[in-house]
């Protein structure tokens, strides 16, 4: 070993070196949180970049760059260090137009904390392992969601466009002439029934157990879907999103109430099945796989 390499190894294995890097990363993170950093922080940035460069140089000199089993680039954690340094120099010395987009990569510096703290490294390792094991469960989840999305598509396609429309139109107005002239939400409120505080027109349906319109209004299928058009079963992708919402129980009761009002109370069976299978079974299956992966990693 050359004297330079011996010195590099001594520095690399020293506990103070790890402490220095850890403190640098944490300080850097504090500086990154500043809203309007003063001018002098530019010099501090250069200091941080210098320390990271020094760290990487020490590692490269001690372990070698990429030829051989235990060299610098053979460790995935060092890829992160390498990317951080490359982007630090890129944003500083190369004019690449939209620098603000590249500056986003400075946030990767915070991730360096993982490689420095051993406990955190283990947890992240377990997380990566669990993701690998999750592939089968994910396939099952996507398959189940797809099946139910297709069922939802068949049952509820277009239903959430049903609205309560005002009967008492002007003598020569028609549904079409009105829809062509409606622009603002104010206009919509003139012709469609809105419950107090609601941002969407009252939903209704054509089956006996679906929601009915108040007196003076009739149920029509017109306009866009609720929630700015994002809530619907009109295409497979929207239906899939709705099913994902049910699975994650993300304000699912609103989707449930909207659909039941537009389609009929009978369809609660669909929601019961989806909540039981998707939300209770599949979510817990995912959690079980993650728990098993952590257990294996600990052993």
């Amino acid at each position: 070993f050359s004297p330079l390499r011996r010195i590099s190894i001594k520095i690399l294995v020293h506990s103070l070196f790890s402490m220095l890097i850890m403190c640098t990363i944490l300080t850097n993170c504090i500086f990154m949180t500043m809203n309007n950093p003063p001018d002098w922080t530019k010099n501090v940035e250069y200091t941080f970049t210098g320390i990271y460069t020094f760290e990487s140089l020490v590692k490269i000199l001690a372990r070698g760059f990429c030829v051989g089993e235990f060299t610098f680039l053979r460790d995935p954690w060092n890829w992160l260090d390498f990317v951080v340094i490359v982007f630090a120099y890129l944003t500083e010395f190369v004019n690449l137009g939209n620098v603000s987009a590249l500056r986003t990569f400075r946030v990767l510096r915070a991730l360096k904390t993982i490689s420095v703290i051993p406990g955190l490294k283990t947890i992240v390792g377990a997380l990566i392992q669990s993701v690998k094991k999750l592939s089968d469960v994910m396939i099952l989840t996507v398959f189940c969601l797809s099946v139910f999305a297709l069922i939802g598509l068949q049952l509820f396609m277009g239903n959430l466009k049903h609205k309560c429309f005002r009967n008492s139109l002007e003598n020569n107005e028609t549904l079409e002439s009105i829809m062509n002239t409606l622009e603002s939400e104010e206009d919509f409120r003139k012709y469609f029934y809105y419950l107090e505080g609601s941002k969407d027109a009252l939903l209704c349906g054509f089956s006996t157990d679906s929601g009915q319109c108040p007196e003076g209004y009739t149920c029509v299928k017109i306009g866009r879907n609720p929630d700015y058009g994002y809530t619907s079963f009109d295409t497979f992708s929207w239906a899939f999103l709705a099913l994902f919402r049910l699975m994650t129980q993300d304000y699912w009761e609103n989707l449930y109430q909207q659909t039941l009002r537009a389609a009929g109370k009978t369809y609660m069976i669909f929601f019961v099945v989806v909540i039981f299978l998707g939300s209770f079974y599949l979510i817990n299956l995912i959690l079980a796989v993650v728990a098993m992966a952590y257990e294996e990693q600990n052993q």
Epitope: H162, S168, K221
Partner: nanobody, 124 residues
Framework: EVQLVESGGGVVQPGGSLRLSCDAS????????MRWHRQGAGKQREFVAR???????DYADSVKGRFTISRDNAKNTVYLQMNSLRPEDTALYYC??????????????????WGQGTLVTVSS
């Protein structure tokens, strides 16, 4: 496809009566308002009477007290009972309705439909 068919038109003497009917056919789920309009020779189409799905009625000033609009929801039909007819009532009478129906492929469509018209002639 939704169709509106008017019937009951004909020639009648002034002061006489006629009953027009308009039948809506197709895979109808719901009919909102149903209206009668008329168009005299060389004139613009004008509103005559309207009835909503909850049977609220409205009439043009020129026919108030003489004409009565009614509907039979079970048959998807609207009627216009015309009494005390005058020569100025001579026109082609059109039926107009807001219909929500199940169309090809099972999807639902709402729209305003018109009939072909039935001719009413009031002359001595």
């Amino acid at each position: 496809e939704v169709q509106l068919v008017e019937s009951g038109g004909g020639v009648v003497q002034p002061g006489g009566s006629l009953r027009l009917s308009c039948d809506a056919s197709g895979r109808i789920l719901r009919i909102g308002y149903m209206r009668w309009h008329r168009q005299g020779a060389g004139k613009q189409r004008e509103f005559v009477a309207r009835i909503t799905d909850d049977s609220a009625t409205d009439y043009a000033d020129s026919v108030k007290g003489r004409f009565t609009i009614s509907r039979d929801n079970a048959k998807n039909t609207v009627y216009l009972q015309m009494n005390s007819l005058r020569p100025e009532d001579t026109a082609l009478y059109y039926c107009n309705a807001l219909v929500t129906a199940s169309v090809r492929g099972g999807s639902i469509h709402s729209g305003t439909y018109w009939g072909q018209g039935t001719l009413v002639t009031v002359s001595s």
